[in-house]
Interface confidence: medium
């Protein structure tokens, strides 16, 4: 993480005493300029050798309120014949994301930042064969 | 793109009028923070049939300042013999994440939320064969 604006006005802060509520501009900007969310949904989830499904996770007090979480469709991968290959495993690629949660009953609105671990998609890996000692 | 809570004390607020600077609790950023869960070991980037590398994207005014973005190692997928399979493509799985950008020269610290599209990992899909008309 970064930036210690060192000045008498912004002194170092101990974690336990850290000013918990800071001002955050919630007008969400896209760092790519173009609308990120306007990208076409990918069909990789069906075409992959490790296909996945997307499950809706909704929380009206969270931004983003709807998060689509991936789950691998099979434990194994699908081969060229469309059959499951028992030497290959479908594994979930996970990623932490930041979300904003509204503090209950807060008025004016107060939010807290939370980390959330979500499944993004699946990939195919060779099974690890454990050697007997 | 913000959460607009409903309550009699906090009347409905149109998005365009939504208070841009709201209070946000950043407690999650105590250096080891509220970890979602213990990080799971993932060497999928090397073991996948569509392996990927991680590339450093740095912006000192952003949290996280350094984001390691996935890029597929090959255009094709790697088969059981370790050779590239020309019927199968490695494709990038992308995910939108929220990042915090520090407003320049702000003290006390003021941040804005931005969306960023990042590469998370790669998956293997069958090549689409385009039929000639």
């Amino acid at each position: 993480a970064a930036i210690i604006p060192q000045s008498s006005a912004c002194p170092n802060t101990e974690a336990k005493d850290f000013l918990q509520n800071v001002k955050v501009n919630l007008k969400v900007f896209n760092s790519l300029g173009a609308k990120v969310s306007s990208r076409r949904p990918s069909d990789y989830l069906n075409r992959s050798t490790s296909p996945w499904t997307l499950h809706r996770n909704e929380d009206p007090d969270r931004y983003p309120s709807v998060i689509w979480e991936a789950q691998c469709r099979h434990q194994r991968c699908v081969n060229a014949e469309g059959k499951l290959d028992h030497h290959m495993n479908s594994v979930l690629i996970q990623q932490e994301i930041l979300v904003l949660k509204r503090e209950p009953e807060s008025c004016p609105f107060t939010f807290r930042v939370e980390k959330m671990l979500v499944g993004v998609g699946c990939t195919c890996v060779a099974s690890i064969v454990r050697q007997a000692a | 793109a913000a959460i607009i809570p409903q309550s009699s004390a906090c009347p409905n607020t149109e998005a365009k009028d939504f208070l841009q600077n709201v209070k946000v609790n950043l407690k999650v950023f105590n250096s080891l923070g509220a970890k979602v869960s213990s990080r799971r070991p993932s060497d999928y980037l090397n073991r996948s049939t569509s392996p990927w590398t991680l590339h450093r994207n740095e912006d000192p005014d952003r949290y996280p300042s350094v984001i390691w973005e996935a890029q597929c190692r090959h255009q094709r997928c790697v088969n059981a013999e370790g050779k590239l399979d020309h019927h199968m493509n490695s494709v990038l799985i992308q995910q939108e994440i929220l990042v915090l950008k520090r407003e320049p020269e702000s003290c006390p610290f003021t941040f804005r939320v931005e969306k960023m599209l990042v590469g998370v990992g790669c998956t293997c899909v069958a090549s689409i064969v385009r039929q000639a008309a």
Epitope: A1, T13 | S31, S38, R39, P41, S42, V66
Partner: antibody, heavy 126, light 107 residues
Framework: EVQLVQSGAEVKKPGESVKISCKAS????????ISWVRQAPGQGLEWMGG????????DYAQKFQGRVTITADESTTTAYMELSGLTSDDTAVYYC???????????????????WGQGTTVTVSS | EIVLTQSPDFQSVTPKEKVTITCRAS??????LHWYQQKPDQSPKLLIK???HSISGVPSRFSGSGSGTDFTLTINGLEAEDAATYYC?????????FGQGTKVDIK
């Protein structure tokens, strides 16, 4: 590559304080945290505390709470560790270490120590 | 705090031999486990991060494995320059803690 250069050896009397500096070069100072780790003669490594730069937050090991202060000055890309109320048990080599705090392999905040200063020897003796 | 226990404390090994050092955590730490090498009168050097991820510039003979509470550092084909003390380090929970160290010397 980030390089960390620490201030020179110190000899102190019991009850005094010591302040060690750690000057960083190469790479953006804003993009990582600094932890302080000490090593008593013939002993292992002991984490004292660290600073997470983006929010200017410090965390200290309970053992050192109230005796240690970690600060940093972005303008000179230097981190500092001050330890007060010294006793002979504080005789050790003190290291600063870079904590990347990257978003890496799917997770926020990496916490390995990927670059270390050369160490500063502090001797406490009456 | 999380206690890390390394074994053995000391190992004397002939060159080209395989060296295995284990580190056991007092509770589940996922893969928040890193390995360092420290030579006499030098600073520690990161060898492996997050249990199994190699570090650029570190020889490929160093590898790591494990998750949860049991971790292993392996040196495949020890070289004379590998004589050092090796430490594991957990970053799952504050405070960061280190193992007591394993000293490896060359026969």
């Amino acid at each position: 590559e980030v390089q960390l250069v620490q201030s020179g050896a110190e000899v102190k009397k019991p009850g005094e304080s010591v302040k060690i500096s750690c000057k960083a070069s190469g790479g953006s100072f804003r993009s990582y945290g600094i932890s302080w780790v000490r090593q008593a003669p013939g002993q292992g490594l002991e984490w004292m505390g660290g600073i997470t730069h983006f929010f200017g937050i410090t965390d200290y090991a309970q053992k050192f709470q109230g005796r240690v202060t970690i600060t940093a000055d972005e303008s000179t890309t230097t981190a500092y560790m001050e330890l007060s109320g010294l006793t002979s048990d504080d005789t050790a080599v003190y290291y600063c270490a870079r904590e990347p705090n990257d978003f890496w392999n799917g997770y926020y905040d990496t916490h390995d120590f990927d670059s270390w200063g050369q160490g500063t020897t502090v001797t406490v003796s009456s | 705090e999380i206690v890390l226990t390394q074994s053995p404390d000391f190992q004397s090994v002939t060159p080209k031999e395989k060296v295995t050092i284990t580190c056991r955590a007092s509770q589940n730490i996922g893969s928040e486990l890193h390995w360092y090498q420290q030579k006499p009168d030098q600073s520690p050097k990161l060898l492996i991060k997050y249990a199994s991820h190699s570090i650029s510039g570190v020889p490929s003979r160093f590898s790591g494995s494990g998750s949860g509470t049991d971790f292993t550092l392996t040196i495949n084909g020890l070289e004379a320059e590998d004589a050092a003390t090796y430490y594991c380090h957990q970053s799952d929970t504050l405070p960061h803690t280190f193992g007591q160290g394993t000293k490896v010397d060359i026969k």
